[in-house]
Structures are given as C-alpha cells and as structure tokens.
Amino acid sequence: ECVTQLLKDTCFEGGDITTVFTPSAKYCQVVCTYHPRCLLFTFTAESPSEDPTRWFTCVLKDSVTETLPRVNRTAAISGYSFKQCSHQISACNKDIYVDLDMKGINYNSSVAKSAQECQERCTDDVHCHFFTYATRQFPSLEHRNICLLKHTQTGTPTRITKLDKVVSGFSLKSCALSNLACIRDIFPNTVFADSNIDSVMAPDAFVCGRICTHHPGCLFFTFFSQEWPKESQRNLCLLKTSESGLPSTRIKKSKALSGFSLQSCRHSIPVFCHSSFYHDTDFLGEELDIVAAKSHEACQKLCTNAVRCQFFTYTPAQASCNEGKGKCYLKLSSNGSPTKILHGRGGISGYTLRLCKMDNECTTKIKPRIVGGTASVRGEWPWQVTLHTTSPTQRHLCGGSIIGNQWILTAAHCFYGVESPKILRVYSGILNQSEIKEDTSFFGVQEIIIHDQYKMAESGYDIALLKLETTVNYTDSQRPICLPSKGDRNVIYTDCWVTGWGYRKLRDKIQNTLQKAKIPLVTNEECQKRYRGHKITHKMICAGYREGGKDACKGDSGGPLSCKHNEVWHLVGITSWGEGCAQRERPGVYTNVVEYVDWILEKTQAV
C-alpha cells in the first residue's frame, strides 16, 4: 500500500540496511525509494534533544512484512519508500539548504557569483554529486564566494553539519539540466581499462549501461558477454570511473562491450526499466517465494506486484504437469541484480517492472510505425493533441504535444488574438477530428505561457506552454514525448516525422485524419540560403525535401517534429513557419526545442 505522508516524532525499530546522510526527510524518502531494498526509513532532524552527530541521519530499512514497529522519538521522522506507489517518481532535487555543510570529497574549489552558479557548475561537472557554497557573508574572508564541488561513493554526503552562511545543494543532472554530452554508443569488442568502483551481474550490455547510469559513481562500464572466454567473468558488468571522466585506455577484446553512463540524459532513456525477457537464462539470488504461473509474462507480473521482488526466473511446466503451470521463482539481492547468471538450464528470467515508474513516462515504447501512406493510425503519435478554440465557433486551431501530465508544448503564434485560456480546449488521444462531439471529454487550459521574447514566428522564440486545468492520465493513446537532452546537441536526428491535421496544400482545409510525413533535416546554413530575408538562428531547426512535396502546412502549427533516437521519441521541433507549403527548396522552419529545455523546465517545475 502507498503511504506518502511522513510520520513525525516516530522511529521505525529494527530492519536497518544502511545509514546515509540527507539534508531533509523528504530527500531521505527519495534515497530510500531509489535504494534496491529500502522499504522504510527513519530520519533524524536537528534538535537540541538529539546528539548532533545523529542529526541528518537517514536510516534505510527493510522488512519482510513491509512494516516495522513504531516507537515515539522526538526529532525522528519516518516514512515509507515510494516503491509501493504507482505515481511517477523523480530523483530531481532543486532545493538549496541554508546553513548546512554537506561533507564529501572536495575535489574542486572555485569562485562563483552565486549559489545558483555553483549548482550549475556542479550540474555540468561529470564527477559532482553535490556542492557547498560559502556566501559573501561567510566569516572567513578568503573562503567567501567559494564553490566546493563534492562527490562520494554513494552520491549522498558522508556527514552533514550546521555551518552559518553557507548553502548546499545537489547536482541537477537528474533534472535534465546538464549540458554534459551523452555518449549513447555501446562499443563492441572493447574493454575500458580503468578503475572499477563496483561490479554486478547483468544479462546484457544494455542492462549494464542502465545500472551504470543510476549508480552515483559510475562514469562508464565494461560488460563481459556470456561468450567471454573466462567463465568466472561471464555476464560481469564492471562499473568504472577515472579522474578525467573518460576512459584512459581502450583495449580491443572480443566478446566484451563498453559504454558510458547516460546520467545527463537519463530523463529521456529508460534507466530502471529492464523489460526484456532472457531465454534459457537463470538468475540466482535470495529466494523470496515460489509460485505457480502460466507463463513468464505472468511470472513477471507476480514479481512486479510483490514489492520486495527484484527479479525472477520462470521454469516452464513439464508436459501435462500442474495444469500447464510452470514455477515462478521470485528473487532479490542486496544490490537489485542477480548474484549469478546461468545459461542453458531452460529458465526464462527478467526483472520487476515496479521500477519503471522511476523512469520518465516518455520513454515507454509505443506501437510500431505504419510505413507507407500518409494517414496515421490510432496510438501512433500519442503525444499529439489538437488544440481547439471555441470562439467564435469551435474549430481546430493548432497542434501541440503532451510533455507532462499537466503540460502541452506548442507554438506561441497560435495565440494571436486569443484573449483568454477559457476559450481553449485540448483534445488528446484523437485520430479523426470527426470524433470530437459536444460530449467529447477535453482538458481546459488554466494558463497560456508564451516565451517573453516572442514577437512573431519568423523572429524565433515561437514556443508556448499550456498548463491544463486537470491532469492527463497516461494511456496507450495519450502519453508524453521526451524532450531532447541538452547532451544530445551533437547528434544528427535521422528519423523525423511531422504530424498534424493541417492543410495538405496551401489552399485547402483542415484534414479529418491525423496526417504524418517523414521529413529530412537540413543544415541551418542551407536553410538560411533559402530564406535570405530572415535570420535563421540556432534556436530554429529546418526540415524539408529539396524537391518539396511534403511539409507541414496551415493548421499543423504548434505540432511536433518528432524524431526517434535510440528507440525513444524526442520532441525535436515545434512546427513554426515557412514560405508556402511544401515548396521546392523552401524547408519548413521549426522551433529548436533543445534550445528551450531550460525555459520549459523553469516554467513547468516552478513551485
């Protein structure tokens, strides 16, 4: 059962796994949620009645019964992990802690104008987990305005003490705010020969990479496949680091794969969700339960529903045994990974899907595209919405994209002459405009947030957010699209589609069925050549065919330019402007979303 509230002056007795230091009970709950075994915690706040060495301790706990006896204790705050909850969870922590010194390894010291600048520095430094900043009121003159970047093995402070006139905070890498590049490639036949900070067992290099991504100290990894010559090292995932942040030596070795942590773009990749099944593979670990199940899918469901289950192995039924049901072994370990992986025994193994909610919803795989034709099918573009105006009569106004459960991203130019959000309706999960009737449910718009530098589409900043009055419940036909990662600025998107109900030619009408077209991207230089009278800035992105023929058009405005990269769809552009529609050598111009990620996050995460 999901319990979100914190229990004041309460301590859970027993069940201790480990103790960490956190600046607040709220953050202790997040740390517990992300820990592979923690189900409950007790945090000690600062209090005159408590020994100062125990202030800010966060004791992570586990229990077979999922609860522990409660004891009254002043300054203790207890609670449950969010593992038991179905809502989306984020590790993002933007809080700044005043008069707290979070201790760790101080590996970088520099002058900063403000705590915000210090936090940005930490966010853009590959090693940094948290920082402490001495304000200009700090007593010691030579330490004023000093920004200390820190890291630890666990990613949490080794101790927290009270210290006047300093502030501390965490890196915002998990808030999608890092400018660090994401190196998504997995390099075959490569071993990175750097120091190992940890090792776990993994069924493939992708799982190894995800484990590296959420491990606080891992910057890159090497995985030995099941064909690796040394038997004792097969399926071994080595989590690595180096002073420079990059591998110092790459050794060419067959049957090994290496890659990098994707910490700075973790909002747009699945990190915790290992959804694949591994055939003829047994995962070993501590046994939690053995239950009968009809299939490996059913076994995965059982594991997902058992809060302590981390992974499973299913052994299919022998012919006519046990009503055709096989055995489902629910398992766990200290680190969430199998203690050993065996092949050739006929088992089918996999992981709990309970942790999928710790990943961004936008990373969920959607149904395969239909290639050929221009009409979309239901569920093909589940982030696409149709924005209607009701004044003077109801009609489709613009497209838009779901980027959060209360947020639509669209173009600013859509709101020319729109006096109030009250006349707007957002319809999601729509394929045909004809589906929209009087009684069709819609989302009202609470607020229109237009970029304050927007003047006209051709000048740029053609971006707007709609805050919905109610939240969107994600389903197969309505779910968010990922924002591009700032760390992916060095990537060429090659699978980009424009969608909308707009005109199919310049003098036309709104289409009934959602249309789609794959559009190649062109360089900004080429785009500038085609629009000599305008300034094509780096905040714009252009796409189109040299011979024309396919393009966004009137009514598509505000809709997405969706690009698939590494199996995840990203909102790379917002349909903005162009000369005519689908004209030869006149590419469409789109708002370059990656350049507005900070703006989007600032507006959508504002308290």
Partner: antibody, heavy 119, light 107 residues
C-alpha cells in the same frame, strides 16, 4: 564546379590510427552533410556515417562506432575521418560524399582515398 | 538494418539493348532510393534519387521506377560508356545501406 578532394593513399601499420581528409570547393560547405563510405577491394559500398558540416553533429553506423571519428573545419571547408586501432580488415578505399539533408542521395563524391594496413 | 538485395551480380547485354536492374529492400523504404554508377577506378556517381528522379546531366536513356520494397533501374539503348557496376542505396533509415552491385558488360 563542386569538388571533393580527398587526401592521398596511406600505408599504415596494424594498431595505428589514420586521418583522411576531404576538402570541399565550389559550394557552401556548411550547407551540407558529409558522408563517409567504405569500399573494400572488389566489394560493395558500406556507409560509415555522416557529419553536419554546420555544427559538427554526427551519426555513425553502429558497426563503425568507436572505430571512426568525424570532424569538420569550416574555415578550410574540410571534413576529416579518423580511423583507429587499424586491422587488415580496414584496408579499403574510403570516399567522402555530400548530401543536402538527412534523407537524400549522395550527389557528389570524392575520388577516394586508399588505405592499406600492413602488419 | 535494411538489407538491399541486387539478385543479379552480372549482366551481359548487347549494344543498343535494354537493361533492367532490380533491387529489393528488406523493408519499406518509401521511394527513398538512389541508383549510382561506378566505373572501374572511379568513385560512384549519382544517377537517380527518389526512386525515379533523374539527376541533372544524366542521359534520358536511364530511368528508375518502383515503390514499397521493389525498385528497378532501366537503361534503354545501351551504350559502351554504360559499362559499369550499378548500386542501389536506401536512405530511408540509418544505417544507409547499399545493394551488392550489378556489373554490366557488353555482350
């Protein structure tokens, strides 16, 4: 007249690295993408990847990730491909070829640069 | 990856004859297909893009057709200068892939 001029033949030892250049002339270099294509002796063509000459963004064929690295120098209208940890299998003719978008044919090609890897 | 299959490796045709070279994609490529000609010792050169659009300067005896997965390059009235290897290439999805080539000779 559009021209892509590649660097001359290279004879290198196994395990070494090599950098092949492709100098563009006769068009606006930063308006295009530069592709790199491998042709082993008597074999077909293999796409290695491409680079956006405007901003240096890249896309690699998975097969060549970690092997090839693309760079551009807009000031000299040149594209480069570095090939590392060379083996005899890397012996081939390497072509640069331009394309106007991420989804278009390769309308102009360099003359090819021959790489021979010997032990 | 999309596999491009040119099932005929060699073709021997008389001068003035008509040639048809086929190319089959393992998946739909929506006409994002090009044909290249490569003469011995030379780099490939573009003949056709978009499955059927003839590039500037390419003789009109060359033509391209097809859709979905199946594409054809046709040469009417074969000339001696057409002796070369012909490659198809898809640019619908990365990695872009080429066919194995069809070598054309004069009978």
């Amino acid at each position: 007249e559009v021209k892509l001029q590649e660097s001359g033949p290279e004879l290198v030892k196994t395990g070494a690295s090599v950098k092949i250049s492709c100098k563009a002339s006769g068009y606006s270099f930063t308006g295009y993408f530069m592709n790199w294509v491998k042709q082993s002796h008597g074999k077909s063509l293999e796409w290695i990847g491409f680079i956006n000459c405007y901003n240096g963004a890249t896309s690699y064929n998975q097969k060549f990730k970690g092997k090839a690295t693309f760079t551009v120098d807009a000031s000299s209208s040149s594209a480069y491909m570095q090939f590392n940890s060379l083996t005899s299998e890397d012996s081939a003719v390497y072509y640069c070829a331009r394309t106007i978008s991420t989804g278009d044919s390769f309308d102009y090609w360099g003359q090819g640069s021959t790489l021979t890897v010997s032990s | 990856d999309i596999v491009m299959t040119q099932s005929t490796s060699y073709l021997s045709v008389s001068l003035g004859g008509r040639v048809t070279i086929t190319c089959k994609a393992s998946d739909h490529i929506n006409n994002w297909l090009a044909w290249y000609q490569q003469k011995p010792g030379d780099a490939p050169s573009l003949l056709i893009s978009g499955a059927s659009r003839l590039e500037t300067g390419v003789p009109s005896r060359f033509s391209g057709s097809g859709s979905g997965k199946d594409y054809t390059l046709s040469i009417t009235s074969l000339q001696t200068e057409d002796v070369a290897t012909y490659y198809c290439q898809q640019y619908w999805t990365t990695p872009f892939t080429f066919g194995s080539g069809t070598k054309l000779e004069i009978k």
